[in-house]
């Protein structure tokens, strides 16, 4: 009896694992084995596919074959007993195009109100993703074990920290990788669960803000308790994208080590141009807090977001305010590459009631003022870009008296 060739061959590639599956054509024939050949593009000869010769099952693994994953290959299969079937040719394919990203490896660390997730590719030193290893991004689904309500977090890198969690609570999550450059979405990791710790005695510092004063950066934060010491550390933001070895070498800001106030001042030249992450930790001598949430700090934005400089022309019932570029030391104006909006606060000198104007223009009219009255004005700049969302500190207040009545022209 003639052997029928196998049908419906499927090629599954996950990371560097190459698996072939097929259907027997004739279930009634026993003791049949199967063998594959492969052919590279531009070659006429067929080569025996190692790992897939004389297979008794309907599955084989040819991961040991060192293929160029970007080169098209063709496969063929036949059944063998005393005689052999005809060859069945599989559609040609390029391994890289066909490959799926496998489940990533996930390690979790717990704090009282945060979880740190360390993610690395499931296959170490993968041949398939050798040129794309730095391009992996990840997404995750996280839920409270008790509730099952899922939250999705997209576009994260090899280390991600989730804040604002509850102490002594079990959270579960699963992670998948993506190569956006190749339109590839991976397979989810197994579910990993971790319980957050008991609430720490000392909470982390909150509401960290950076501003510029003279040639210095001023870093401020809020803290619940008095008589604490604080330390501040920085890290190049790009290192978060680099899967590297999961060791992030946070560095001390020398002027912000063991400070006793909820702010510290350090020279602008501590940082070269770039984007940094900053974090703050509190200690009372016996206990140490977990680190604060990390804030992004862009020297370019911070440097240019000085408080605006303005001139006031006083009329009887209004002020005309002309906003100019802030001056650096040496009286040179700061070049502003970002669109800004201006917040102008004014009040009667004898009163605390402040009024506010928000304006995109650099010439602003403050209306409805009383004649011969001293009003004070201060202003600050905001970036219009939601992602950057930065504000300068307020300028010093400037106080002027309005003119007598009937000088509004």
């Amino acid at each position: 009896k003639n052997l029928k060739s196998p049908q419906k061959v499927e090629v599954d590639i996950i990371d560097d694992n190459f698996i072939l599956r097929w259907n027997r054509s004739d279930e009634s024939v026993g003791n049949v084995t199967f063998s594959f050949d492969y052919q590279k593009t531009g070659m006429d000869n067929w080569i025996k596919l190692s790992g897939c010769q004389n297979i008794t099952s309907t599955k084989c693994n040819f991961s040991s074959l060192k293929l160029n994953v970007y080169e098209e290959i063709k496969l063929r299969i036949r059944a063998e007993k005393e005689n052999t079937s005809s060859w069945y040719e599989v559609d040609s394919f390029t391994p890289f195009r066909k490959a799926q990203i496998g489940p990533p490896e996930v390690h979790l660390e717990a704090e009282d109100k945060a979880i740190v997730i360390h993610i690395s590719p499931g296959t170490k030193d993968s041949v398939m993703w050798a040129l794309d290893g730095l391009s992996f991004t990840y997404s995750l689904v996280i839920w409270k074990n008790s509730s099952g309500v899922e939250e999705r977090i997209e576009n994260i890198y090899s280390r991600h920290k989730i804040y604002k969690l509850s102490p002594e609570t079990t959270y579960c999550l699963k992670v998948k990788a993506a190569l956006l450059t190749s339109w590839k979405i991976g397979v989810y990791s197994p579910v990993h669960c971790i319980k957050t710790t008991v609430e720490n005695e000392l909470p982390p510092p909150e509401n960290i803000e950076v501003s510029v004063q003279n040639q210095n950066y001023v870093l401020k934060w809020d803290y619940t308790y008095a008589n604490m010491t604080f330390q501040v550390q920085w890290l190049h933001a790009f290192l978060k994208r680099n899967p590297g070895n999961h060791l992030y070498k946070w560095k001390q800001i020398p002027d912000c080590e063991n400070v006793k106030t909820t702010q510290c001042v350090f020279p602008q030249n501590v940082f070269q141009k770039g984007i940094y992450l900053l974090r703050v930790q509190a200690s009372d001598g016996n206990n140490t807090s977990f680190w604060s949430e990390e804030i992004k700090f862009d020297t370019e934005i911070q440097a240019f977001l000085l408080p605006p400089v303005f001139n006031i022309r006083s009329l009887s019932d209004s002020f005309h305010i002309y906003i100019g570029a802030p001056k650096q030391s040496g009286n040179t104006p700061v070049i502003q590459d970002y669109p800004l909006i201006y917040e102008i606060i004014f009040w009667e000198n004898t009163s605390n009631a402040e009024r506010k104007i928000i304006e995109k223009k650099t010439d602003v009219t403050v209306p409805n003022l009383k004649p011969l009255t001293v009003y004070c004005v201060k202003a600050r700049a905001h970036t219009m870009d939601e992602k950057l969302n930065k504000s300068s500190v307020f300028s010093d207040a400037v106080c002027e008296k309005t003119k007598p009545g009937n000088t509004s022209k």
Epitope: E109, E111, D112, I194, H246, L247, K249, N287, T288
Partner: antibody, heavy 118, light 107 residues
Framework: QVQLVQSGAEVKKPGASVKVSCKAS????????IHWVRQAPGQGLEWMGR????????KYAPKFQGRVTMTADTSISTAYMELSRLRSDDTVVYYC???????????WGQGTLVTVSS | DIQMTQSPSSLSTSVGDRVTITCKTS??????VAWYQQKPGKAPKPLIY???YRYSGVPSRFSGSGSGTDFTLTISSVQPEDFATYYC?????????FGPGTKLDIK
């Protein structure tokens, strides 16, 4: 494979200094921290400090501050720990270890016995 | 400094027994705890990092658990090669510290 190989045993007089070396292979020393831990005979482990070989930033345990100096020469993948004003209770085994973030101290040197005796 | 206490300080056991060693820290260290095994005249051998993850090559009979201030190392079925001293280690904040050790010997 990853290895940390330390210099050989030393005998020193009280008041002298000792410099122990730790040669790294199988990894780039600049990408990690090198920690130093010591152990007195029959006693537990005691953390001394660490160095970032990339920029020579150090952290020392308060107990050794002022007496210990950690340095590194990245061109020969070697870290050093120098302890000055030696006393008899510095007769211990000194270990270097690689620190790998949340993987902690994942590789250790074989140890260097320093004997302080007059 | 973060103080670490380990109990028991020594433990006599037999091959096949299940053994649990506990470690307490004087403050919350999250999950920043590692465990090391040391035999006489040898360097410490890493067993567990980040409270519960085994280093590659470490047998599955070793497991770690806990968080915050209370941590545990368990050997599910003690083997002859497991008789040694075990140390816990916190790497949450400087200065890093070790527990005083637990000596496991043959009953």
């Amino acid at each position: 494979q990853v290895q940390l190989v330390q210099s050989g045993a030393e005998v020193k007089k009280p008041g002298a200094s000792v410099k122990v070396s730790c040669k790294a292979s199988g990894f780039n020393i600049k990408d990690y921290y090198i920690h130093w831990v010591r152990q007195a005979p029959g006693q537990g482990l005691e953390w001394m400090g660490r160095i970032d070989p990339e920029d020579a930033e150090t952290k020392y345990a308060p107990k050794f501050q002022g007496r210990v100096t950690m340095t590194a020469d990245t061109s020969i993948s070697t870290a050093y720990m120098e302890l000055s004003r030696l006393r008899s209770d510095d007769t211990v085994v000194y270990y270097c270890a690689r620190y790998h973030g949340y993987w902690a101290l994942d590789y250790w040197g074989q140890g260097t016995l320093v004997t302080v005796s007059s | 400094d973060i103080q670490m206490t380990q109990s028991p300080s020594s433990l006599s056991t037999s091959v096949g027994d299940r053994v649990t060693i506990t470690c307490k820290t004087s403050q919350n260290v999250g999950t920043n705890v590692a465990w090391y095994q040391q035999k006489p005249g040898k360097a410490p051998k890493p067993l567990i990092y980040s409270t519960s993850y085994r280093y590659s090559g470490v047998p599955s009979r070793f497991s770690g658990s806990g968080s915050g201030t209370d941590f545990t190392l368990t050997i599910s079925s003690v083997q002859p090669e497991d008789f040694a001293t075990y140390y816990c280690h916190q790497y949450f904040s400087y200065p890093y510290t070790f527990g005083p050790g637990t000596k496991l010997d043959i009953k």
